[in-house]
């Protein structure tokens, strides 16, 4: 008797998902000497164990704890870069500024970046046809819970001055419903984090507005201040120039106006 597969609204598991995760793990440990103790087969087994044979709308953070334990990694103080709705630029930045780290520069974030996955209740199969959509199906799906879990941990372990890159082109520069707004902001530890510095990235070349005065940034400042963490904000008016100056800080044109600083 054929068993009818659950149809979800989201796209299915990324093609060759197991191979991708394992190969990324091998590559990551090859490049990062401090992670060469990691056994990638065990990492994959823990990843698989978090969602295989489980109903994909009932995944919990607990399901990912064995994986989180295996992927334990620390970022030096002052070197954490969070981002919201501006992933590409954040990643371009850390590729140049190699001593700063986004979540996707860490093992677990690197393994899962841009991938989708889910299983099916009571079978050992991976569902390549469809996976739950966060809005249309459920929020407790394997992908969403994974990012919530690792984002929480990433924020919890941050220390010193934490930086966040925000997209100044969006109507809500700071969005309370984003992973940054709903998870990371609330899991920064005041006893370890002295300050949060927001970098608001401008979209238009002629945009000279002070986006640090945006109501949503004021909202972020309020949330952070209430948590006894200081808040700073910078406008990055020219992201292309900003990256260029990170690459070549000695360039004479880099000594002026790529950003405007606000102390709050």
């Amino acid at each position: 008797v054929p068993r009818w597969r659950q149809q979800w609204s989201g796209s299915g598991t990324t093609s060759r998902f197991p191979e991708t995760v394992l190969a990324r793990c091998v590559k990551y440990t090859e490049v990062h000497p401090e992670m060469r103790h990691v056994d990638c087969q065990s990492v994959w087994d823990a990843f698989k164990g978090a969602f295989i044979s489980k109903y994909p709308c009932n995944i919990t953070e607990e399901d990912y704890q064995p994986l989180v334990k295996l992927g334990t990694q620390t970022v030096p103080c002052n070197k954490t870069l969070l981002w919201s709705r501006i992933k590409d630029l954040a990643h371009q930045f850390t590729q140049v500024q190699r001593d700063m780290f986004t979540l996707e520069d860490m093992l677990l974030g690197y393994l899962a970046d841009d991938l989708t996955w889910c299983g099916e209740f009571n079978t050992f199969e991976i569902n390549y046809q469809s996976c739950p959509d966060w809005r249309k199906d459920c929020s407790n799906n394997p992908v969403s819970v994974f990012w919530k879990t690792v984002s929480r941990r990433f924020a919890e372990t941050a220390c010193g001055v934490v930086h966040v890159m925000l997209n100044g082109s969006r109507s809500k520069i700071f969005d309370k419903n984003s992973t940054f707004g709903s998870v990371e902001v609330h899991n920064l530890q005041p006893e370890k984090v002295q300050a949060l510095e927001a970098w608001v990235i401008h979209g238009g070349r002629e945009d000279s507005r002070d986006l640090c005065q945006d109501p949503t940034i004021k909202e972020l400042e309020s949330i952070i201040s209430k948590r006894n963490i200081r808040f700073f904000c910078k406008n990055i008016y020219r992201p292309d120039k900003f990256l260029q100056c990170v690459k070549n800080p000695e360039d004479s044109s880099c000594l002026s106006g790529i950003h405007h600083h606000h102390h709050h």
Epitope: R16, E19, T20, L22, A23, C25, V26, K27, T29, E30, P33, E34, R36, H37, C40
Partner: antibody, heavy 116, light 107 residues
Framework: QVQLVQSGAEVKKPGSSVKVSCKAS????????ISWVRQAPGQGLEWMGG????????QYAQKFQGRVTITADESTSTAYMELSSLRSEDTAVYYC?????????WGQGTLVTVSA | EIVMTQSPATLSVSPGERATLSCRAS??????LAWYQQKPGQAPRLLIY???TRATGIPARFSGSGSGTEFTLTISSLQSEDFAVYYC?????????FGQGTKVEIK
Amino acid sequence: QVQLVQSGAEVKKPGSSVKVSCKASGGLFSFYAISWVRQAPGQGLEWMGGIIPFFGEPQYAQKFQGRVTITADESTSTAYMELSSLRSEDTAVYYCARGSYRFDVWGQGTLVTVSA
Amino acid sequence: EIVMTQSPATLSVSPGERATLSCRASQSVSSNLAWYQQKPGQAPRLLIYGASTRATGIPARFSGSGSGTEFTLTISSLQSEDFAVYYCQQYNNWPWTFGQGTKVEIK
């Protein structure tokens, strides 16, 4: 149980090239790295480079850069190491091994003799 | 590149005795060090990785220690099958490099 089986011994002229194959069986080939290590007669071990077949981007030791080409064919679970511009000092046993930095499974070795 | 120096070049030991092999790195390799055993006409075999973790199937008489630049492989009670050449290898910095080997022979 993963096994790596290498191609047979080769005798080559100086200046020519040699291509050694390494076929994997009994395990998942694509995402583990395959490295190449050589050993000249009576000498120690020397890492030449490696590849993660899934990504297909090889990594080479500086010493062999420009002379060695490491490739992998996922469809046949086979890795290849080609060494060009051979000289007498390249006479050695060439091993493939599983792993990108520590090598837990080794092929049986392929003797390459470079002689005029 | 990092130079790995093993000592002694040859170690003569009686069966049942303890053997201690040393490996020194020209700069710190943290704990990213492996030990291999090689018998004549055979491929090397991984014994220890991460400086002190025994590979699958390796008997407990083999143990590794050290970190940074100084490492030791100890064989607590030599068996006849342990007489071979032993190599250390660092995998902290590209290119990975091996020591020149220590030959453990029957006294």
